[in-house]
């Protein structure tokens, strides 16, 4: 059999990151400054850096503080995300369904029924994998029915998330290889929910969501 499996590369992530900036004035005071008296009307039009006047004070956006939101905070604490996701791009060939043009149309009843049964079948296949979230069919094409789909995985963020997801992707490979070897047409009969072509299973790509604190910081800035 020729099942092709690619390798996946990810980079390790620190648990917490503080990005320092170099402000020209005193750091870390409250980000809202109350104004009382006649001069407040003037202040309203002078809120800087995207600050908005709420009738009493400038409401400053993240990263700014001061009476007019003119001061830049010195540092931002960026915690890691709650969860990390991975996406495996797979192709399997379903032999128990004949391809029809209607299957190309994702809004057709044929596609919806196929999707429902394929999803049900894959939920059974991957039922023992805690990180398994679901499948998403991206394309159906001729031959009997070639199913291009994503297997979606998710795990809680821990320093070991990469190992957890690497292990999960290996189990996905094992399970899909096993089911597509076992559930095959015998004498043109499929005695299962779905039957597969043993040699039609391929893993094209594995993507793990990267946690990049510097990028997060840039987005916040």
């Amino acid at each position: 059999r020729t099942t092709s499996f690619p390798t996946v590369t990810t980079t390790a992530v620190p648990t917490n990151t503080t990005i320092k900036s170099n402000p020209t004035s005193t750091p870390t005071v409250p980000r809202t400054t109350t104004c009382f008296g006649d001069g407040c009307q003037n202040t309203a039009s002078r809120c800087k850096n995207g600050g908005t006047w709420d009738g009493l004070k400038c409401q400053c956006p993240n990263l700014y503080y001061g009476e007019l939101c003119e001061e830049v905070v010195s540092s931002i604490d960026i915690g890691p995300p709650e969860t990390i996701s991975a996406q495996m791009e797979l192709t399997v060939t379903v032999t128990s369904v004949k391809f029809t043009e209607e299957l190309k149309n994702h809004s057709s009843q044929e596609f919806q029924e196929f999707k429902q049964t394929f999803t049900e079948q894959m939920n059974i296949v991957y039922s023992g994998i805690p990180e398994y979230v679901g499948v998403n069919i991206t394309k159906l094409r001729l031959g009997s029915v070639v199913v291009e789909h994503d297997v979606l995985l998710r795990t809680k963020y821990t320093p070991e998330y990469k190992t957890v997801l690497d292990n999960a992707t290996e189990v996905v490979k094992e399970k899909i290889t096993k089911v597509t070897t076992q559930q095959i047409m015998i004498n043109d009969i499929c005695s299962d929910m779905m039957c597969f072509n043993t040699t039609g299973t391929q893993v094209q790509n594995i993507t793990v969501t990267q946690y990049d604190p510097e990028e997060d910081c840039r987005k916040m800035a």
Partner: antibody, heavy 120, light 113 residues
Framework: QVQLQQPGAELVRPGASVKLSCKAS????????MHWVKQRPGQGLEWIGM????????RLNQKFKDKATLTVDKSSSTAYMQLSSPTSEDSAVYYC?????????????WGQGTLVTVSA | DIVMTQSPSSLAMSVGQKVTMSCKSS????????????LAWYQQKPGQSPKLLIY???TRESGVPDRFIGSGSGTDFTLSISSVQAEDLADYFC?????????FGAGTKLELR
């Protein structure tokens, strides 16, 4: 919900062929094989064969290869079975049935059956 | 062709009793690679179409009461009804879904005393 509609009865003269219909609704007609099953009064069930709406391919039990012809009309979601040169042995209830999915081989849905009576 | 043999051909039971009926196949219906037995059971009430009860020898179709229990492996299979109800009066057929031509047993008629 899935429905397979069959006429209740057909009276046919010996030797005159009869064409039985099965109109499907409530599911995607083109991705399921349609099967036909025979049941003689007070007896068991016999699998006749199956046809596929997407390309009209049919597969028959060898026992019925000279008796039954299976066809489909995709536009009306209707499957047909023609019985040639009927004799009293062909008097039976004929069911159309839909498998669990695609090419699966156990039957989740059945028509009400057509009682064929071969009589002069 | 795979021959399916059912026994007994009929049995009479009282409401609440446990019922057991047998189905034997002339060759094994076990797929050794996935350990599934390719056997289905149907119920046919008088004047009605057959209704799927069980497939893969022991998997109940959705909506089928849990008093219906399928068991067995290889060539010997059993359908049990743990506590017979009046509405269970029917013929019961086994069917192999292992190879063409698909074949059925002759049936077991369940009558109520």
């Amino acid at each position: 919900q899935v429905q397979l509609q069959q006429p209740g009865a057909e009276l046919v003269r010996p030797g005159a062929s009869v064409k039985l219909s099965c109109k499907a609704s409530g599911y995607s007609f083109t991705i399921y094989w349609m099967h036909w099953v025979k049941q003689r009064p007070g007896q068991g069930l016999e699998w006749i064969g199956m046809s596929h709406p997407s390309d009209s391919e049919s597969r028959l039990n060898q026992k019925f290869k000279d008796k039954a012809t299976l066809t489909v009309d995709k536009s009306s979601s209707t499957a047909y079975m023609q019985l040639s040169s009927p004799t009293s042995e062909d008097s039976a209830v004929y069911y159309c049935s839909r498998p669990y999915y695609g090419s699966s081989a156990w039957f989740a849905d059945w028509g009400q059956g057509t009682l064929v009576t071969v009589s002069a | 062709d795979i021959v399916m043999t059912q026994s007994p051909s009929s049995l009479a039971m009282s409401v609440g009793q446990k019922v057991t009926m047998s189905c034997k196949s002339s060759q094994s219906l076990l797929n050794s690679s996935n350990q599934k037995n390719y056997l289905a059971w149907y119920q046919q009430k008088p004047g009605q179409s057959p209704k799927l009860l069980i497939y893969f020898a022991s998997t109940r179709e959705s909506g089928v009461p849990d008093r219906f229990i399928g068991s067995g492996s290889g060539t010997d299979f059993t359908l049990s009804i743990s506590s017979v109800q009046a509405e269970d009066l029917a013929d019961y057929f086994c069917q192999q879904h292992y190879s063409f031509p698909l074949t059925f047993g002759a049936g077991t008629k369940l009558e109520l005393r």
